[in-house]
Interface confidence: medium
């Protein structure tokens, strides 16, 4: 099963995100780079380059980390950085792109699950106040049983991808994360023009499955009101 | 394809009550969550409010906290506004949209054309 995004066009009256992912008040999960709004019925991206400042790498999105921009520079000023590829060096598992992880100081490839389950923490799905507001949002927990989740499965709140069953990973569901479907061949996928676009994700897809990449599809006729499909295709 | 079909708009006095509905329908294997946003005359589309199966939450704007509603029938694939209270700045088109696992393609709501949405008018 798959999943879908409330994304379109920026819009500048959605208010920012809550203060840390449900269930880990000090988790952020803030904006992110190339990142879409609810709002209009196209899928808008900025060419341009628009450095992201983060602090962690929980806040870019699934092909960047959390850096300075610069060897040595200055540790207060980090940005969205893109991943690295495979064999590329690296010093921990977030600089490495998805479907590789971090091993020896090089980016090598997770094909069959080598370090998930490395970083297993116990997700508590506890919401902290019933009626909580920060920064112009509301969120208001409800009570039912089939909205439980077991830990890693389709739908689960997840820290990072290291929580999800294989075949799934962590992307952002509102102002927390919940495990969802990697990309198959043929299914429409997000693709960020040089990480522009700046903005709250409230809804994030997964990345491509391996062997895949996020491409536009060549036969896709735009419609009136339609953005331009771009799809997971063989490499 | 995922169609979203909004009703129960109309004109109201301030003060007065509304419910909207929201039928999603199409290749809907299930919804995580579903929201409504809206679009007054001249002005950008805005989030409202959302609920979330997955995350156990409902989500609303400040402008609409503590007047307006959100709820769902999960099984009917149908979510609802409940609005109370209206003021005159309520009055838009209100859009819903939703956020699922769905057969055949992955499908986000700038995929396709929203639906033609329902107008809210509050005057008097």
């Known amino acids: 099963t798959l999943n879908s995004v409330l994304n379109s066009n920026a819009i500048k009256n959605l208010p920012p995100p809550l203060g840390g992912a449900a269930g880990h008040p000090g988790s952020a999960v803030s904006a992110a780079p190339g990142i879409l709004y609810p709002g209009g019925n196209k899928y808008q991206t900025i060419d341009n380059y628009q450095p992201y400042p983060c602090a962690e790498d929980e806040e870019c999105g699934t092909d960047e980390y959390c850096a300075s921009p610069t060897r040595g520079g200055d540790a207060g000023v980090q940005i969205c950085l893109a991943c690295r590829k495979r064999r590329k060096r690296c010093m921990r598992h977030a600089m490495c792109c998805p479907g590789n992880y971090c091993k020896n100081g090089i980016c090598v490839s997770s094909d069959q699950n080598h370090f998930r389950g490395e970083i297993e923490e116990t997700i508590t799905e506890s919401f902290g106040n019933d009626h909580s507001t920060l920064d112009g949002y509301s969120r208001r927990t409800t009570l039912s049983s089939k909205m439980y989740h077991t830990k890693g499965q389709e739908g689960s709140v997840c820290l990072r991808s290291s929580d999800c069953a294989s075949g799934l990973c962590c992307a952002r569901h509102f102002w927390s994360k919940i495990c969802k479907p990697v990309l198959k061949e043929g299914q429409v996928c997000t693709k960020h023009r040089r990480k522009g676009s700046h903005g709250l994700e409230i809804f994030q897809r997964c990345y491509c499955g391996e062997g895949l990449s996020c491409r536009i599809q060549k036969d896709h006729h735009q419609a009136s009101n339609s953005s331009r499909l771009h799809t997971c295709q063989r490499h | 394809e995922v169609q979203l079909v909004e009703s129960g708009g109309g004109l109201v006095q301030p003060g007065g009550s509304l419910r909207l509905s929201c039928a999603a329908s199409?290749?809907?294997?299930?919804?995580?969550?579903m929201g409504w946003f809206r679009q007054a005359p001249g002005k950008e589309r805005e989030f409202v409010a959302a609920i979330s199966w997955s995350v156990s939450s409902t989500y609303y704007a400040d402008s609409v906290k503590g007047r307006f509603t959100i709820s769902a029938d999960n099984s009917k694939n149908t979510a609802y506004l409940q609005m109370n209270s209206l003021k005159p700045e309520d009055t838009a088109v209100y859009y819903c949209?939703?956020?699922?696992?769905?057969?055949?393609?992955?499908?986000?709501?700038?995929?396709?054309?929203w639906g033609q949405g329902t107008l809210v008018t509050v005057s008097s």
């Open positions: 199409g290749n809907i294997d299930r919804l995580y969550a």
């Open positions: 949209a939703a956020e699922g696992g769905y057969s055949g393609t992955y499908y986000y709501t700038g995929d396709f054309d």
